[in-house]
Interface confidence: low
C-alpha cells in the first residue's frame, strides 16, 4: 500500500492565500483558465497537471450523443484537433478503473519527501497551502464528442495552434501539424498539404467530432459553448427556426443546461449533425476544504471537496479524484497519515464532469512543524548547597523555546528558557536535596508540540541544619528532662542531636544521641542551668536553641 508522494523539497515561509475550510473559490476565479503564477509571492512554481492515471476516454457514436464530456484545460484553448480513433481507443476504459479507496478510508500512505533546505522560519508554524487558481474571466472547458471506432467518418485534416496540457481523449497537436486517418485507423502526423475529394461528406460525417469549450463568465455566471470547427456553421435548436450560433458560439447558457444543437454547413450534405450540449455546474459551487485536525497537521494531510451551493446538474455525473505521489484516490476526500513534518507536499485534485476533467487544482501543502527533538548531551551538577547548573546542546529539529522543570519531591518548578541558551544556573536550591531535572524543547505550531524530555539528577551540598523544634524542658530536684523535634531543614545526612548543659560558664554535661530525648541527672538542686540543644547533620552543626531552666528546691530537705 505504500505510495511515494513527490514533494517539492522546499520549505517556504510565505504562502499565498487559497480557499480552504470555509472559503469558497474566489469570485474572480475561473477554474478552467490557465494558471497565472506571475503574481505569486513565494518562490515555487505551480502547475495543474493532469493525473497520471487518467484513463477517461469515452467513445461516443454519432447516433448516441449523450456523453458529451467536460475536460479541464490548463492552457489557453482555441481550436482543438479532433480525436482520431485508434485500436487503442476501443480498449481504453472509462473512469472507475482506478483503485478505489474504501468509503471513508484514511489512506495510510508512505510518502517520501526529498531532503529539505536548512532555512527555518521564525513564523509560528502555519500549515500553508498553495493551489493553482486560474484568474481569466472567461476561459474554456473543452468538450469532445468522439465517433465510434467503426465509424467511416472521413474527417477533414485540421490544424491546432495550441498545446493543451490536459491528458484527455482528444489528440492535441502542435501548430502546423495535421492528422489524417490511415487505413488501419491509426493517427498519422503529416504535412499540411492534404489531397481533397470532390464529393461532399454528410454533415454527420464532417462534424462527427466537434470539440466544445465551455467558456465561463464569472460575472454573469453563464457559459458560452464554443464549437471548435473551421467554418462558421449554422446551429438551430429543436425548433429549427433560427441560427442560435454567433461565430460558432452558443451564448448565455446557464449551468446544468442540457440542449440539442443541430449543426449544418453548405460544405456538407444531409441537413445537419445533432450535437448535445451538457453545461457543467458553476465553478464557485465547489470548495476544497483543508480538513486536517490541528493536532495532526504535522504528519497528516486531509483534503475534501465540498459542494457549497446546490445546483440542478445530475450529481452522478460528478466524480472526484486526488493524486498524491503515485497513488490515485477516487473519493471526494483524502486523509494521508504518517507524513514528514514541515515539508511541502504536492497533491493534484480534479473534479470530473461526465467523466472528463472539469476543475483541476494542484495543492502544495506544507505540513506543520513537527515535534522537536530531544536536547542532546544534557549534563547537570551541583555547584554548592544552594546552586546547580545544567548544560545541553540544542535538538536537531525546529523549536521555539525550552521548558526546564526541576523537582525535589513533592515540589516542582518549571521555567521557560530562551531557545538560544545552552546553560542554565539554578539558584536558591535547598541544601542536601536530590533534584530531578527535565529539559524539553517545544514549538508553538497549530498546537504546542513538546519534544521528548532529557533528564538528569544532582544532589546539592550539605549546609548547617536549622534549629531543633519544639524544645521542652521538664525539671525535678536534681535532674532535667529535655525533649525536642527534628529541625525543619536537616540539610544533610541523618546525624545526632546534641545537648550542652552549662552552669554559669562551666560545661557540666555534653550529650549526643540519635533521638532528642535527654535525661540529665545528678544536678544541683535549685540551680539555674543553660541548656543548648542543636542538631549536627554529619557535616555541620545547627544553631542551638538555648533555654535557661532551674532545678527544683530540694523537696526532701
Amino acid at each position: 500500500q505504500g505510495s511515494t508522494l513527490s514533494p517539492t523539497g522546499r520549505r517556504t515561509t510565505k504562502m499565498p492565500s487559497v480557499p480552504l475550510s470555509s472559503d469558497p473559490l474566489p469570485t474572480h476565479t475561473t477554474a478552467f483558465s490557465p494558471a497565472s503564477i506571475s503574481e505569486r509571492e513565494n518562490d515555487f512554481s505551480e502547475t495543474t497537471p493532469s493525473l497520471s492515471s487518467d484513463n477517461t476516454s469515452t467513445q461516443v457514436s454519432p447516433d448516441s450523443l449523450d456523453n458529451a464530456s467536460a475536460f479541464n484545460t490548463t492552457g489557453v484553448s482555441s481550436a482543438l484537433t479532433p480525436h482520431l480513433p485508434t485500436h487503442a481507443d476501443s480498449q481504453t476504459p472509462s473512469t472507475g478503473t482506478d483503485t478505489q479507496t474504501p468509503s471513508g478510508s484514511a489512506a495510510n500512505t508512505t510518502l517520501s519527501p526529498t531532503p529539505r533546505s536548512n532555512d527555518i522560519s521564525d513564523v509560528p508554524g502555519e500549515r500553508s497551502t498553495a493551489s493553482t487558481f486560474p484568474t481569466d474571466p472567461i476561459s474554456p472547458l473543452a468538450t469532445t464528442l468522439i465517433p465510434a471506432r467503426n465509424s467511416s467518418a472521413a474527417l477533414p485534416a485540421r490544424t491546432s495552434n495550441t498545446t493543451i496540457t490536459a491528458n484527455t481523449s482528444v489528440s492535441y497537436l502542435n501548430a502546423s501539424e495535421t492528422t489524417t486517418p490511415s487505413p488501419s485507423g491509426s493517427t498519422v502526423i503529416s504535412t499540411p498539404t492534404i489531397a481533397t475529394t470532390t464529393s461532399k461528406p454528410t454533415c454527420a460525417e464532417k462534424y462527427a467530432t466537434i470539440p466544445v469549450d465551455y467558456l465561463y463568465n464569472n460575472k454573469t455566471k453563464l457559459f458560452t459553448a464554443k464549437l471548435n470547427v473551421n467554418e462558421n456553421v449554422e446551429c438551430t435548436n429543436n425548433n429549427h427556426t433560427h441560427n442560435i450560433c454567433t461565430n460558432n458560439e452558443v451564448l448565455n447558457l446557464p449551468e446544468c443546461k442540457e440542449m440539442n444543437v443541430f449543426v449544418s454547413h453548405n460544405s456538407c450534405t444531409d441537413r445537419h449533425k445533432e450535437l448535445k450540449l451538457d453545461v457543467p455546474p458553476e465553478v464557485e459551487k465547489f470548495q476544497l476544504d483543508d480538513c486536517t485536525p490541528d493536532v495532526e497537521a504535522n504528519t497528516t494531510i486531509c483534503l475534501k471537496w465540498k459542494i457549497i451551493e446546490t445546483f440542478a446538474c445530475d450529481k452522478s455525473k460528478i466524480t472526484y479524484r486526488f493524486q498524491c505521489g503515485n497513488k490515485t484516490y477516487n473519493k471526494e476526500g483524502i486523509y494521508l497519515e504518517n507524513l514528514e513534518p514541515e515539508y511541502e507536499y504536492k497533491c493534484d485534485s480534479e473534479i470530473l464532469y461526465n467523466n472528463h476533467k472539469y476543475i483541476n487544482i494542484t495543492k502544495l501543502i506544507k505540513t506543520d512543524f513537527g515535534i522537536p527533538g530531544q536536547p542532546q548531551n544534557v549534563v547537570c551538577r551541583h555547584e554548592d548547597a544552594h546552586q546547580g547548573v545544567i548544560t545541553w546542546n540544542p535538538p536537531q529539529r525546529s523549536f521555539h523555546n525550552f521548558t526546564l522543570c526541576y523537582v525535589n519531591k513533592p515540589a516542582k518548578k518549571c521555567l521557560i528558557l530562551d531557545k538560544h541558551l545552552t546553560t542554565y544556573h539554578l539558584q536558591n536550591l535547598k541544601p542536601y536535596t536530590n533534584y530531578s531535572l527535565s529539559l524539553h524543547a517545544y514549538i508553538i505550531a497549530k498546537v504546542q508540540r513538546n519534544g521528548t524530555a532529557a533528564t538528569c539528577n544532582f544532589t546539592t551540598e550539605s549546609a548547617p541544619p536549622s534549629q531543633v523544634q519544639n524544645m521542652i524542658v521538664s525539671t525535678s530536684d536534681n535532674s532535667m528532662h529535655v525533649k525536642c523535634e527534628v529541625p525543619r531543614d536537616v540539610n544533610g545526612p541523618t546525624g545526632l542531636y546534641h545537648l550542652e548543659v552549662e552552669a554559669g560558664n562551666t560545661l557540666v554535661r555534653n550529650l549526643s544521641q540519635s533521638k532528642c530525648d535527654f535525661s540529665v541527672n545528678n544536678l544541683q538542686y535549685s540551680t539555674y542551668y543553660n541548656l543548648k540543644a542543636y542538631y549536627h547533620n554529619g557535616k555541620y552543626s545547627g544553631e542551638p536553641v538555648i533555654l535557661r531552666e532551674s532545678t527544683s528546691y530540694n523537696s526532701k530537705a
Epitope: S103, G104, S105
Partner: antibody
Framework: EVQLLESGGGLVQPGGSLRLSCAAS????????MTWVRQAPGKGLEWVSS????????YYPDRVKGRFTISRDNSKNTLYLQMNSLRAEDTAVYYC????????????WGQGTTVTVSS | DIQMTQSPSSLSASVGDRVTITCKAS??????LDWYQQKPGKAPKLLIY???NLQTGVPSRFSGSGSGTDFTLTISSLQPEDFATYYC????????FGQGTKLEIK
C-alpha cells in the same frame, strides 16, 4: 456485513471505573475513524469521543475530558472506552459507531451496552 | 461549543403528511450536518449526510436542505415506519447532536 458489538457495560459505584470494548468486523477497521455516542435513559444522543484511524487524533467534549480515554487496537479490530471517576450522570446506553470521515457521518452503529452508575 | 437547536421537540402527524423538522446552529457550520432516525430500543440510523445527501438504502421521501446555520429535514409523505425520533448532528467544529424531535402518530 459491517458489525459492531459493544461489551463491558454494567453496574458501578460513583467514582468507579469501567472499560467498554467494541469489536468490529466486516470492514477494514484501520481505515475508519470511530466514535462513542451515549444516550441517557429517556434523553437524546450525546457525543462522547472520537478517534482517528491511526489513533493520532482524539477528541472529547468537556464533560468527559480527563475522565474518559478512547483508544483502539487496529490489530484486534477493537475500539475501547476507559471510563474513570464515573458519576451518576454517566448512566446511559453507550454506542460505538463507524465514522465515515468524508461525510462526517456515522454510517454503522452497534447495538449499545448499558452503563449504570449508582450507589 | 456549537449548540444545535431542533424544533419542534415533538410533532404529531398522519400517514401521508408532509413533515418538516428544522435544526438551527449557534454559528455557521457550512453544510456539515447529518440527520439520524432512532426508534425505541434501537441504535440510531443515518438518513442524510452533509445536509442533503441521501444515505444508501434510505427512501427518497427523505430529503435535507440548508447551509450555514439553518437546516431542514423533510419527509414528503409519511409512512407508518417513519414514526420515530430524529436528531440532527453537526461535525463542523467538534461534534454536537440536536436535542431530538419525536414524531408521533396523530
Amino acid at each position: 456485513e459491517v458489525q459492531l458489538l459493544e461489551s463491558g457495560g454494567g453496574l458501578v459505584q460513583p467514582g468507579g471505573s469501567l472499560r467498554l470494548s467494541c469489536a468490529a468486523s466486516g470492514f477494514t477497521f484501520n481505515n475508519y475513524w470511530m466514535t462513542w455516542v451515549r444516550q441517557a435513559p429517556g434523553k437524546g444522543l450525546e457525543w462522547v469521543s472520537s478517534i482517528s484511524s491511526s489513533g493520532g487524533s482524539i477528541y472529547y467534549p468537556d464533560r468527559v475530558k480527563g475522565r474518559f480515554t478512547i483508544s483502539r487496537d487496529n490489530s484486534k479490530n477493537t475500539l475501547y472506552l476507559q471510563m474513570n471517576s464515573l458519576r451518576a450522570e454517566d448512566t446511559a446506553v453507550y454506542y460505538c459507531a463507524r465514522d465515515e470521515r468524508w461525510a462526517g457521518a456515522m454510517d454503522a452503529w452497534g447495538q449499545g451496552t448499558t452503563v449504570t452508575v449508582s450507589s | 461549543d456549537i449548540q444545535m437547536t431542533q424544533s419542534p421537540s415533538s410533532l404529531s402527524a398522519s400517514v401521508g403528511d408532509r413533515v418538516t423538522i428544522t435544526c438551527k446552529a449557534s454559528q455557521n457550520i457550512n453544510k456539515n450536518l447529518d440527520w439520524y432516525q432512532q426508534k425505541p430500543g434501537k441504535a440510531p440510523k443515518l438518513l442524510i449526510y452533509e445536509t442533503n445527501n441521501l444515505q444508501t438504502g434510505v427512501p427518497s421521501r427523505f430529503s435535507g436542505s440548508g447551509s450555514g446555520t439553518d437546516f431542514t429535514l423533510t419527509i414528503s409523505s409519511l409512512q407508518p415506519e417513519d414514526f420515530a425520533t430524529y436528531y440532527c448532528y453537526q461535525h463542523n467544529s467538534r461534534f454536537t447532536f440536536g436535542q431530538g424531535t419525536k414524531l408521533e402518530i396523530k
